[in-house]
Amino acid sequence: KAMHVAQPAVVLANSRGIASFVCEYASPGKATEVRVTVLRQADSQVTEVCAATYMMGNELTFLDDSICTGTSSGNQVNLTIQGLRAMDTGLYICKVELMYPPPYYMGIGNGTQIYVIDPEPCPDSD
Amino acid sequence: KAMHVAQPAVVLANSRGIASFVCEYASPGKATEVRVTVLRQADSQVTEVCAATYMMGNELTFLDDSICTGTSSGNQVNLTIQGLRAMDTGLYICKVELMYPPPYYMGIGNGTQIYVIDPEPCPDSD
């Protein structure tokens, strides 16, 4: 009955602080409404990074002020997190909920370790 | 005879392509001459990155054209690898050999996964 969620073990943010990864879930049923949440786990503390609910076949829309963007294709969600700094390095967990129709299912990935390196500032132009 | 060698699991190179890590070995005897080798494992291929032999209490000297530098303190070697690019991301293994006096011991660490992100080029100054 458990829903399997797969995500990569490690991802590197690029030098602009953008990290992308795919979250894939094995849907036990024909879900039409899906909610995807990205959680960050540091020590034993878990916090929400962003979340979006979408109708299957439609676009994934995060809130305007969200640091996440994403697209969906079948049972795959392509997630992008931006504005990352070195201090944001950590484990990012993908949580998927099949909200409708019944039954409800929840699946949690093992997490993607995102590494972020702050860039060196460019020299001032004289 | 086997000798235990410890090294961190993961290290991030900084934005200038420099990565540092400590390689620590549990010396079974009173070695006076030690050789440290850094190996890179990609797929199943292992290549030598750099190597240095040093006398206990003396400085660690790599060849002039080596991309490695290091210092030693007791049974710890502080290794720095420079000039790294994103394509150099991989598993870097620390190998320690106690060359003298007998008996000879060799120890190999589990490897340090070094992640390297290429920086964005700075904009041209007009």
Epitope: K1, A51, K95, M106, G107 | -
Partner: antibody, heavy 118, light 108 residues
Framework: QVQLVESGGGVVQPGRSLRLSCAAS????????MHWVRQAPGKGLEWVTF????????YYADSVKGRFTISRDNSKNTLYLQMNSLRAEDTAIYYC???????????WGQGTLVTVSS | EIVLTQSPGTLSLSPGERATLSCRAS???????LAWYQQKPGQAPRLLIY???SRATGIPDRFSGSGSGTDFTLTISRLEPEDFAVYYC?????????FGQGTKVEIK
């Protein structure tokens, strides 16, 4: 700190209605799904109903389906349970519970007792 | 519906002893979706373990969880006086959310 406070319990006759409330504080209420769980005197825990973040999705235990309605007002940080056509077997302590980020019920209210008796 | 069966119904032990509580599911439950709760008389349940083996915030390390598939265990390594209570397992991976019938840990 996180707090859930239930109210609205009491003694009611079979066939009548009752509305329970759960006031939430100390967290962003709209970011969490919520549940009602009940416990009959001397018995174990029984899940009753669930509501999604925005209140659009609701699930019920078979034992209360068609009689109970869960709702939420995110602007008031309050969860509700409307109980109609009450039966003697609905007698229980009713707890509201928050779903933690990873799924378990991480915070519970102190409970409110509903007694259905003629 | 996933039915959870706990055993034993009652466990009579002395402080300092080790308690082993079992929870068996009627079908496979992902270990990420199994929790344990503690309930004392007159109190609400309290989350102890989630994801089969992760301790909730503030829970002492004498409590540990293990298992996968259909068989899960809660272990209390050395019973303290405050540990005598009723313990429930729960699955939360799919609706309907279900609880075991509980195991009472009482003082011998």
């Amino acid at each position: 700190q996180v707090q859930l406070v239930e109210s609205g319990g009491g003694v009611v006759q079979p066939g009548r209605s009752l509305r329970l409330s759960c006031a939430a504080s100390g967290f962003t209420f709209s970011s969490y799904t919520m549940h009602w769980v009940r416990q009959a005197p001397g018995k174990g825990l029984e899940w009753v109903t669930f509501i999604s973040y925005d209140g659009n999705n609701k699930y019920y235990a078979d034992s209360v389906k068609g009689r109970f309605t869960i709702s939420r007002d995110n602007s008031k940080n309050t969860l509700y349970l409307q109980m109609n056509s009450l039966r003697a077997e609905d007698t229980a302590i009713y707890y509201c519970a928050r779903t933690g980020w990873l799924g378990p019920f991480d915070y519970w209210g102190q409970g409110t007792l509903v007694t259905v008796s003629s | 519906e996933i039915v959870l069966t706990q055993s034993p119904g009652t466990l009579s032990l002395s402080p300092g002893e080790r308690a082993t509580l079992s929870c068996r599911a009627s079908q496979s439950v992902g270990s990420s979706y199994l929790a344990w709760y503690q309930q004392k008389p007159g109190q609400a349940p309290r989350l102890l373990i989630y994801g089969a083996f992760s301790r909730a915030t503030g829970i002492p390390d004498r409590f540990s969880g293990s298992g996968s598939g259909t068989d899960f265990t809660l272990t209390i390594s050395r019973l303290e006086p405050e540990d005598f209570a009723v313990y429930y397992c729960q699955q939360y991976g799919s609706s309907p959310w279900t609880f075991g019938q509980g195991t009472k840990v009482e003082i011998k």
